[in-house]
């Protein structure tokens, strides 16, 4: 059976696959997925290894019409470096010389300057080029190589290994060499895979059942460290509770060097955030941090300095801490908008079982704003999801120059933000550079400001506008007609109506169904519309919902079916990759994120059309 990294190299014109007959003869044969000699895989960014021989495809020189054969894999050799050129061409790196079928006289695969059909190769059984099954570096744990990546294939006791192995061990632990020749270099590490006993790589907090992995001997950049955690179905550490910080202070007390954690300000337009999307509500900065120097966008925990946090350049090489298991956040069920019939008094706006009101004109210090909201039967607003934030910004009359109190504050416990209405903190959206909370400026309260309504901490004594929120009454005379302008069964959002197509359909069938309804497969123009659609389909049991995006017209260029410009994307990790196809929204944990699927897969879908009675805004001029 093929493992997911392996593939057969297929020439469509001849309907044959590459076959490594021997190290000196790389030819073609009728495709056979069970033949080891036809299996290949990427073993670095640019090397392709024969699974049968554990040798790499290469050439004797970068010249036209030389035979491509197998060589001992050498990551430094220019003659083994391949790259995908446009479409399905595979070429030697840096040259216009391509992997070619050969001809009647020449049975061997050749390096050739021609780029016709005989130089075009796909992964057998797919329409993808060879790079779509690319190499993913595997970062090692423990060992003596500072967390370096596995070098495949590697030599151990004069035998070649193309995968992690338990050779030399009686306990089943999997390891790899981090250079091609373990026998000479003696550099190795353990693989970030599941095997018996691998749980001893983790420390489990008995109180929360969350597990932590301290990789103090590694030396990786922040992005590499994050990748290493993700390879173990974990994430870089987030800290949202004081207890969690205390536990980690104890866990790292014997160490001295900094360790990467998930805190970063890598998002261009927003502030500090955790990579696992936990809310940034607890602060434990080292005095003087975060420094405002440009480029210092990633954060390390300093065991030698009481485990406090410091922002550094993300390319620095440090150890790191991974975290997995139950989130430390309290479980808090946020009702989706459609679940709750919402009835509100005059001048209050309904959303998901609550009523909201902006007080813009009567400016008050935070304490007085809170008192007013409570007198009205509510509280300063708490915000628990991007959808709720989107509702406040898009439907409550929020204006880009507003600066309005919300309920978040750290008055009770310094550096630990809480909602004034007592609900748990499950979501934060800080402005760039926020929360700044400088010690010489007591900034214990939080405002929403700017065009996106992101948040900043602020001194509580500033007189500002504010947003109140209260639980809606279960019934009342004033029912707001939200779906005006939409047919029965369609849902209104801003100027559009949306409908879930409940028949499992291919992309083409879904598109046709929407057209039959005088609509089209949904476009997604900005993060607010994305937030709405996430709340619309994100909690549904089906895995995917088609959108109108695909690259079926021009491979590699994604377009909406209605030929609107693509101005916003929300790709899932590793997407769109190099796979051609049609785009569907995920549900569940990855709710709303976009995946590229084969267009003939069957999924539900979302149709969209202009609401009736809505004046179309002018198209933006370019």
């Amino acid at each position: 059976l093929l493992d997911t990294r392996q593939f057969l190299i297929y020439n469509e014109d001849h309907k044959r696959c590459v076959d490594a007959v021997s190290p000196s003869a790389v030819q073609t044969a009728a495709c056979n997925q069970d033949a080891e000699s036809q299996k290949f895989r990427w073993v670095s960014e640019s090397q392709i290894m024969s699974v049968a021989f554990k040798l790499c495809l290469g050439v004797p020189s970068k010249t036209d019409w030389v035979a491509i054969t197998l060589y001992a894999c050498d990551s430094k050799s220019e003659f083994q470096k391949w790259e995908c050129k446009n479409d399905t061409l595979l070429g030697i790196k840096g040259e216009d010389l391509f992997f070619n079928y050969g001809n009647r006289q020449e049975k061997n695969i050749m390096l050739y300057k021609g780029s016709g059909l005989w130089s075009r190769w796909k992964i057998y059984g797919t329409t993808d080029n060879l790079c779509s099954r690319g190499y993913e570096a595997m970062y090692t744990l423990l060992g003596n190589a500072n967390g370096a990546t596995c070098a495949f294939p590697f030599k151990f006791e004069n035998k070649w290994y193309a995968d992690c192995t338990s050779a030399g061990r009686s306990d089943g632990w999997l390891w790899c060499g981090t250079t091609t020749d373990y026998d000479t270099d003696k550099l190795f590490g353990y693989c970030p895979l599941k095997f018996e006993g691998s749980e001893s790589l983790w420390n489990k907090d008995p109180l929360t059942s969350v597990s932590y992995q301290i990789n103090s001997k590694s030396a990786l950049t922040w992005h590499q460290a994050r990748k290493s955690c993700q390879q173990q179905n974990a994430e870089l550490l987030s800290i949202t509770e004081i207890h969690e910080q205390t536990y980690l202070t104890g866990l790292t007390s014997s160490l001295t060097s900094g360790l990467w954690i998930g805190l970063n300000s890598l998002s261009f337009n927003s502030g500090w955030q955790w990579s696992d999307r936990s809310p940034f509500r607890y602060l434990n900065w080292l005095p003087g941090s975060p420094s405002a120097e440009p480029g210092k966008s990633c954060v390390s925990l300093n065991p030698g300095k009481n485990a406090k946090w410091e922002n550094l350049e993300c390319v620095q090489k440090l150890g790191y801490i991974c975290k997995k298991g139950n989130t430390t956040l309290n479980s808090f069920v946020i009702p989706s908008e459609s679940d709750v019939p919402t009835h509100c008094p005059s001048q209050w706006w309904p959303y998901a079982g609550h009523c909201y009101k902006i007080h813009r004109d009567e400016k008050k210090i935070q304490r007085d704003a809170l008192t007013t909201c409570r007198k009205e039967g509510g509280d300063l607003t708490s915000i628990h999801t991007i959808e709720e934030l989107d509702f406040i910004i898009s439907q409550l009359g929020y204006e880009p120059n507003d600066e309005l109190w919300i309920g978040l504050n750290d008055i009770k416990i310094q550096m630990y933000f809480e909602w004034s209405d007592g609900t748990p903190v499950t979501f934060t959206k800080w402005l760039r550079g926020e929360p700044s909370h400088e010690n010489n400026r007591q900034e214990d309260c939080v405002v929403m400001k700017g065009k996106d309504g992101y948040w900043a901490d602020r001194g509580c004594e500033w007189p500002l506008g504010y947003i109140c929120k209260m639980k809606s009454r279960s019934q009342g005379p004033e029912i707001v007609e939200v779906e005006k302008g939409c047919r029965k069964g369609w849902k209104k959002h801003h100027f559009y109506c949306y409908m879930i197509g409940h028949t499992l359909s291919t992309f083409a069938e879904a598109n046709q169904t929407c057209n039959n309804e005088n609509a089209y497969l949904t476009t997604i123009e900005d993060r607010y519309e994305q937030a709405f659609l996430t709340s619309f389909v994100g909690l549904r049991p089906e895995k995917y919902f088609w959108t109108g995006l695909s690259d079926i017209q021009t491979k590699g260029t994604f377009q909406w079916t209605i030929e609107e410009e693509v101005r916003f994307t929300h790709w899932n990790s590793d997407m769109p990759g190099r796979k051609p196809g049609c785009v569907a929204m995920r549900t569940g944990i990855a709710g709303g994120l976009w995946d590229v699927l084969k267009c003939d897969e069957k999924a539900k879908f979302v149709c969209k059309h202009w609401a009736e009675g809505v004046t179309h805004p002018p198209k933006p001029t370019t």
């Epitope: 423990l142 003596n144 151990f156 030399g168 009686s170 306990d171 632990w173």
Partner: nanobody, 120 residues
Framework: QVQLQESGGGLVQPGGSLMLSCAAS????????MGWYRQAPGKQRELVAA???????NYADSVKGRFTISRDNAKNTVYLQMNSLKPEDTAVYYC??????????????WGQGTQVTVSS
């Protein structure tokens, strides 16, 4: 480097008892399995008993019900309590451990051996 230090061997009468212990030291991340093997003169080395880090044990049929293996993970130590000893238990007893180290992918380490003689 990793070392295994055995103790507790000696001369004992049939029906008597002995307790062997073996402590591992050195560059150790974790010990996955610890066990005891024995080798009588002119015979192959054979497994006596082994214990995983989670406490799962297995025994040679010839010692079941008489020998008990246990370990103290905090001290990286394994014990073998031998009761109702018989003359055929006479052998050199070797401690063995499958250890995760930072220095080498090899896992199996052996002690020097301790002599157990059962004789009247």
């Amino acid at each position: 480097q990793v070392q295994l230090q055995e103790s507790g061997g000696g001369l004992v009468q049939p029906g008597g008892s002995l307790m062997l212990s073996c402590a591992a030291s050195g560059n150790i991340f974790t010990i996955n399995r610890m066990g005891w093997y024995r080798q009588a003169p002119g015979k192959q080395r054979e497994l006596v008993a082994a214990i995983t880090s989670g406490g799962n044990t297995n025994y040679a049929d010839s010692v079941k019900g008489r020998f008990t293996i246990s370990r103290d993970n905090a001290k990286n130590t394994v014990y073998l309590q031998m009761n109702s000893l018989k003359p055929e238990d006479t052998a050199v007893y070797y401690c063995n451990a499958a250890i995760v180290t930072m220095t080498s992918p090899y896992s199996d380490y052996w002690g020097q051996g301790t002599q157990v003689t059962v004789s009247s």
